[in-house]
Interface confidence: low
Amino acid sequence: EAHKSEIAHRYNDLGEQHFKGLVLIAFSQYLQKCSYDEHAKLVQEVTDFAKTCVADESAANCDKSLHTLFGDKLCAIPNLRENYGELADCCTKQEPERNECFLQHKDDNPSLPPFERPEAEAMCTSFKENPTTFMGHYLHEVARRHPYFYAPELLYYAEQYNEILTQCCAEADKESCLTPKLDGVKEKALVSSVRQRMKCSSMQKFGERAFKAWAVARLSQTFPNADFAEITKLATDLTKVNKECCHGDLLECADDRAELAKYMCENQATISSKLQTCCDKPLLKKAHCLSEVEHDTMPADLPAIAADFVEDQEVCKNYAEAKDVFLGTFLYEYSRRHPDYSVSLLLRLAKKYEATLEKCCAEANPPACYGTVLAEFQPLVEEPKNLVKTNCDLYEKLGEYGFQNAILVRYTQKAPQVSTPTLVEAARNLGRVGTKCCTLPEDQRLPCVEDYLSAILNRVCLLHEKTPVSEHVTKCCSGSLVERRPCFSALTVDETYVPKEFKAETFTFHSDICTLPEKEKQIKKQTALAELVKHKPKATAEQLKTVMDDFAQFLDTCCKAADKDTCFSTEGPNLVTRCKDALA
């Protein structure tokens, strides 16, 4: 139904707390350099205005669209051009072009310092003094670093953060209570961020149809007892929610997500038997829980997929009459039978099936032509299965850090032109797939591994788009989203690369490395490893292991020495010489 005042409608639907949180996220994602205080002031002004409209929907400007209202606020910020450069040009445009312009200026890798967590005592003090401001800072800091973070889900993580602080700040040993819990939330939030970014990339690059196909596959796996009409309805709604969030329409997105959760809980009988525990929770927890609910038990008597999609004499007729519906039912039927496949794999199979029908239905004897299509799926299925086995075996042998290093070497050889920080970030993220997925039961490994890798590689593509330096990466990133991971896996050593000359300063370290946290130490060592590979792209695994072991030994010795500085300045050059010799 149409509302006289959109802003009043959303304020009423969402309530003041969520309304303010979402407006803060929206502003922080658009203008990523502004301070919390600047944004908090704008949020308060928007909220006061919304309340005016709730009181009187006919009041001045209450009938304006949210984009107009928010855009006008952003464009009124002083020193916009000085701080944001050409983003200020967006303000010369009219809606909807102005919002599109803001979206195009979102920066996936803003030059902001890492979000440092204060020590426990200080955190608890500021949390107790003003919980609302504390959580506002959290929303602001995460949103500006992750401009496509799924807004309603960020509210959920803020709520988790709040609950952890409430619990741990009452304990005697705040630090040991907070650290593991907040680390857990951070890890989950970072994964959520890359997954959502992948969804927005799918929407931006390939449109709603591509996203809807992803949703049909994913929902069919999770709800194999829901009928195709139900899955289509859920996929349509989910597509709308994600389109809104990716497009910066965060109030609409959160409102529609709440509606979708309500619908699912009211229609459990026709969706899944596993929803009840989610549906008993309050809104943010309910929607989060539904988004990762376990798969329902598959119907016992599903007929073989071949019956309707290969053996049926009407295949070409059904395909010609309604291509999208027929392919949709294929994707639905195949996905509900294969919760053990990744969504990426299911979409590749659907694409292969479509290509086969396109070719065969134009021939004299279509059934003879498409009769072998299911057998032709085999290599497409085997490839990711082998990838999972090989990589999980390697992870089990090396552990997370060693596995990250193996991936770092592999990817530096594939794309040595890519900047070392990007390679290290990618390898560390790709390496976490082991910890995240390889410990799962066999039937859950493939979907976990491949869909996570796809999301991480999407980030690699986004960062590379800013400064394209590798033809290998450009080639893999230009194709379809579902082909990216196989494309990256198939890359070999880049033969066109001219090795970097050996610079001693790249491998010169100082005693300050000794006091760094373990994670930072690892990053320093991994940076050196990537630089070594760039110097000698064809170095063997043994050579690299020798050098890295020597390096680790050097750090251990010097960090234990009484006079660390002297040790680093005398042993360092010896290490560099030994490295050069080992790689010669």
């Epitope: 009928d227 195709f228 009409a229 139900e230 289509t232 309805k233 349509t236 709604d237 619908y263 229609n267 026709t270 309707d308 049926d312 059904n318 009459e321 309604a322 519906v325 027929f326 039912t329």
Partner: nanobody, 124 residues
Framework: QVQLQQSGPGLVKPSQTLSLTCAIS??????????WNWIRQSPSRGLEWLGR?????????GYAASLQSRLAINADTSKNQLSLRLSSVTPEDTAVYYC??????????????WGHGTMVTVSS
């Protein structure tokens, strides 16, 4: 406007087969924007979904796992009606049986049309 007219016996003996029909007007049983369900309600079990059928370039049928072996739902396109057959009934199957059409529309999502319900008692 969609209307569902149910018919069938009110009393069935144990071990016999219960048969109900649901005549549809205002929509087609083979239309591609609806799904046709049977649901029952009893004091002991509450509201219970039994199964559904719908057409999307072929017929799909789904049953509640607990009734899989005893239940058959069919659509008759020539009569534009839905039928339910539940075999080997016991007093536990005593309930009000509803025929429910779920209609999917692009924007507003789904809305349901319910039949008036048939009270079925299983007793000798």
């Amino acid at each position: 406007q969609v209307q569902l007219q149910q018919s069938g016996p009110g009393l069935v003996k144990p071990s016999q087969t219960l048969s109900l029909t649901c005549a549809i007007s205002g929509d087609s049983v083979s239309g591609n924007s609806a799904a046709w369900n049977w649901i029952r309600q009893s004091p002991s079990r509450g509201l219970e979904w039994l199964g559904r059928t719908y057409y999307r370039s072929k017929w799909y049928i789904g049953y509640a796992a607990s009734l899989q072996s005893r239940l058959a739902i069919n659509a008759d396109t020539s009569k534009n009606q839905l039928s339910l057959r539940l075999s080997s009934v016991t007093p536990e199957d005593t309930a009000v049986y509803y025929c429910v059409g779920r209609h999917y529309s692009g924007h507003s999502g789904a809305f349901d049309t319910w039949g008036h319900g048939t009270m079925v008692t299983v007793s000798s």
